[in-house]
Interface confidence: low
């Protein structure tokens, strides 16, 4: 079956630039299908723009002024590219890619979207860094005794743009596992959202990741943090150095992305 | 030009009540056209529902029922026993794709319906509320209760800046919140909520008694490692205070 | 202009072979799934194979299975059907039939041959 | 013997209507779309209608299908003399790993 991945979730540009934006296919041979791409203006329908066949002939949408868009396709990196040349207010859309996909019954066929890449126009000059930062909350030990079950708080902050994804993994495991979200909010020039993942007592011994994906991530790549295991037995520990914490106080763990 | 449009704008639906979608034609006979139907949701995914030719998208075909009335020139999507997994911007869209001929292989699409999931009415319940803490950061966790009414506060006399709550539906049919805030204060903060004329304070589900139990943070892997832990031997660590604990970028 | 070209029909004894062609022009055949269809003379029409635009699925009527092979090129938009093993009771005019522009079919069939006529007998 | 049945012959007069019926069961018609065919004496079938419905470009509106459970029905109003042919209807069947299947054809006379 066809899969499509957009893996820029947003692609912010100055008045003027180009934006190119990429559409991966698995599953299927690029060369032996089409590739569509379509937008959607905030408050307006999903609009078809320009299509890529099989044999490299290029479609586009009556209407749409030529040279604005270019699409093409790399067979060897099974990529499709949507260019769009001197981006302007009104380009400002999510820009879905998308194929025709035979199902397993005869006759059977759908049309699949890719995830879209929302476009952005800005003439801001943002700090150097506007990658999501993390803090982490781990379980209140009242919900671990009370309810046998934990919830673990992803906290992001000071990102821009506001297009952003987090889902959460066991370590060792690519089950996506359900999670809630609140809203992403405006604080200042930047923006903020938070995601919490309940689980039974059981996983808690397991540890957690929340996996976030966002265009100023470090070198592109999804940020995962980290959250560790947690367990409810008596914990006695050996000296290490020479601290002059009081046993009532908080035990702190200061956790450093070293790869930032 | 042919135009696709939704009978409504938004449609409230119950969770496990049956809903009904409508997508009128207009400017051409229904019957020449293929009907689909997609679901985009939160993260923008656009999924694929519905396709006439009894076609399905995986895990649809039990939950979704689509239909054509040539008649009244509309297209209905049926969602049998809706559940908060439903919740998304509902399109409707059509091709000609495989009418013999001449045809097109692109999507009209019409305007987005938004369906929103609300709870079935139940027995109301009452919230267990739970605090964690990391630096300045608290957020007040507020978990299963109905109706949806609710008023957060995060008690404290030194705030930085407080957010609108979150609240969403739970796996189980009634409702979670959260509330986040930064105070100067943390370690005093406590959560207070107003729901169905009573107050539930955080502090009612302390753990009081002095146990040795507690969570353990584990040193992590990959490339976030924990700096130098400075521990005092046979700590025993207040088990309302551990999940305190930052992460520094 | 859109057509299906048929050649390749005649007698044949039975036990023999032939090769049924079918060539396409003005469309994008590349596209389709194709079919055969057959028809005896005084009788009604029966679908004899299938074949999908990439041949990746490939269907007979049981009657032929095992002595008929569809196949295609998609570079000269060409059909073929190659018959072993004929019969008396394969006799019929034979139909090449274009069917809707999917990967698979559509189950109907909007394009057809003028037909070409197989005779087995001894 | 044909997996879709039909009656071998009707006839009407011309300006009547007529319908020509087409049973299966539930692993062809039940649960896949029909289309119709005409064929006037020697020359080669016509898609008349497809997906039970539909009819292609071309095809006047006196022509009409329809589907209800593992039955199908074409109706032809205004009857004329150029109707005069065979009327095959098709579709698949998931039970068998086949090609099409067609009824065994009905031969519309026009009186």
């Known amino acids: 079956a066809g899969h499509l991945e957009q893996p820029q979730i947003s692609s912010t540009k100055t008045l003027s630039k180009t934006a190119r934006l990429e559409c991966v296919v698995s599953g299927i041979t690029i060369s032996a299908t089409s590739v569509y791409w379509y937008r959607e203006r905030p408050g307006e329908v999903i609009q078809f723009l320009v299509s890529i066949s099989y044999d490299g002939t290029v479609r586009k949408e009556s209407g749409i002024p030529s040279g604005k868009f270019e699409v093409d396709r790399i067979p060897e990196t099974s990529t499709s590219t949507l260019t769009i040349h001197n981006v302007e207010k009104q380009d400002i859309a999510t820009y879905y890619c998308a194929l025709w996909e035979a199902q397993q019954e005869l006759g059977k066929k759908i049309k699949v979207f890719g995830p879209g890449t929302k476009l952005i126009i800005t003439d801001k000059q943002l700090d150097a860094d506007v990658s999501p930062k993390p803090t982490i909350f781990l379980p209140s030990i009242a919900e671990t005794k009370l309810q046998k079950a934990g919830t673990y708080l992803c906290l992001l902050e000071k990102f821009f743009p506001d297009v952003i994804k987090i889902h959460w993994q066991e370590k060792k495991s690519n089950t996506i596992l359900g999670s809630q979200e609140g809203n992403t909010m405006k604080t200042n020039d930047t923006y903020m959202k938070f995601s919490w993942l309940t689980v039974p007592e059981k996983s808690l011994d397991k540890e957690h990741r929340c996996i976030v994906r966002h265009e100023n991530n470090k070198n592109g790549v999804d940020q995962e943090i980290i959250f560790p295991p947690i367990k409810t037995d008596v914990i006695t520990m050996d000296p290490k150095d020479n601290c002059s914490k009081d046993a009532n106080d908080t035990l702190l763990l200061q956790l450093t992305n070293t790869s930032a | 030009a042919i135009e696709l449009v939704p009978e409504h704008q938004t449609v409230p639906v119950s969770i496990g009540v049956p809903a009904t979608l409508r997508c009128s034609m207009k400017g051409e006979a229904i019957g020449n056209y293929y009907i689909n139907w997609y679901r985009k949701t939160q993260g923008n995914t656009m999924t694929f529902i519905y396709r006439e030719k009894d076609i399905y998208g995986p895990g649809f075909k039990d939950n979704f029922q689509g239909d054509i009335d040539i008649a009244k020139n509309l297209a209905v999507l049926k969602i049998l026993a809706p559940s908060e997994r439903d919740e998304g911007s509902y399109y409707c869209a059509c091709d000609t794709l495989g009418m013999g001929g001449e045809y097109t292989d692109k999507l009209i699409f019409g305007k987005g319906t938004r369906v929103t999931v609300e709870p079935r009415s139940q027995p109301h319940t009452k919230p267990s509320v739970f605090v964690m803490k990391n630096g300045t950061n608290v957020a007040c966790l507020v978990k299963e209760f109905y109706p949806k009414d609710i008023r957060i506060n995060l008690v404290s006399s030194k705030k930085i800046t407080e957010f609108d709550p979150a609240i969403v539906i739970s796996p189980s049919g009634k409702y979670n919140a959260v509330k986040l805030g930064k105070y100067e204060d943390s370690n005093s903060v406590t959560c207070s909520v107003q729901h169905d004329n009573k107050t539930v304070h955080s502090t009612d589900f302390e753990v009081k008694t002095d146990s040795t139990d507690h969570v353990k943070p584990k040193e992590t892997e990959n490339t976030k490692q924990p700096s130098k832990s400075c521990h005092k031997p046979k700590a025993i660590v207040h088990t309302e205070k551990v999940n305190m604990m930052s992460l520094t970028v | 202009e859109v057509q299906l070209v048929q050649s390749g029909g005649g007698l044949v004894k039975p036990g023999g072979s032939l090769r049924l062609s079918c060539a396409a022009s003005?469309?994008?055949?590349?596209?389709?799934?194709m079919n055969w269809v057959r028809q005896a003379p005084g009788k009604g029409l029966e679908g004899v194979s299938s074949?999908?635009?990439?041949?990746?699925?490939?269907y007979y009527a049981d009657s032929v299975k095992g002595r008929f092979t569809i196949s295609r090129d998609n570079a000269k938009n060409s059909l073929y059907l190659q018959m072993n093993s004929l019969r008396a009771e394969d006799t019929a005019v034979y139909y090449c039939?274009?069917?809707?522009?999917?990967?698979?079919?559509?189950?109907?069939?909007?394009?057809w041959g003028r037909g070409t006529l197989v005779t087995v007998s001894s | 013997q044909s997996v879709l049945t039909q009656p071998p012959s009707v006839s009407a007069a011309p300006g009547q209507k007529v319908t020509i019926s087409c049973s299966g069961s539930?692993?062809?018609?039940?649960?896949?779309?029909v289309s119709w065919y005409q064929q006037l004496p020697g020359t080669a079938p016509k898609l008349l209608i497809y997906?039970?419905?539909k009819r292609p470009s071309g095809i006047p509106d006196r022509f009409s299908g329809s589907k209800s459970g593992t039955s199908a029905t074409l109706g032809i109003t205004g009857l004329q003399t150029g109707d005069e042919a065979d009327y095959y209807c098709?579709?698949?069947?998931?039970?068998?790993?086949?090609?099409?299947?067609f009824g065994g054809g009905t031969k519309l006379t026009v009186l």
């Open positions: 003005g469309f994008t055949f590349s596209r389709y799934s």
């Open positions: 539930s692993s062809n018609i039940g649960n896949n779309y």
């Open positions: 039939a274009r069917d809707g522009p999917t990967v698979n079919w559509d189950y109907y069939f909007d394009l």
């Open positions: 098709g579709t698949w069947d998931s039970s068998l790993s086949t090609s099409v299947v």
């Open positions: 074949i999908s635009s990439s041949s990746s699925y490939i």
């Open positions: 997906d039970n419905n």
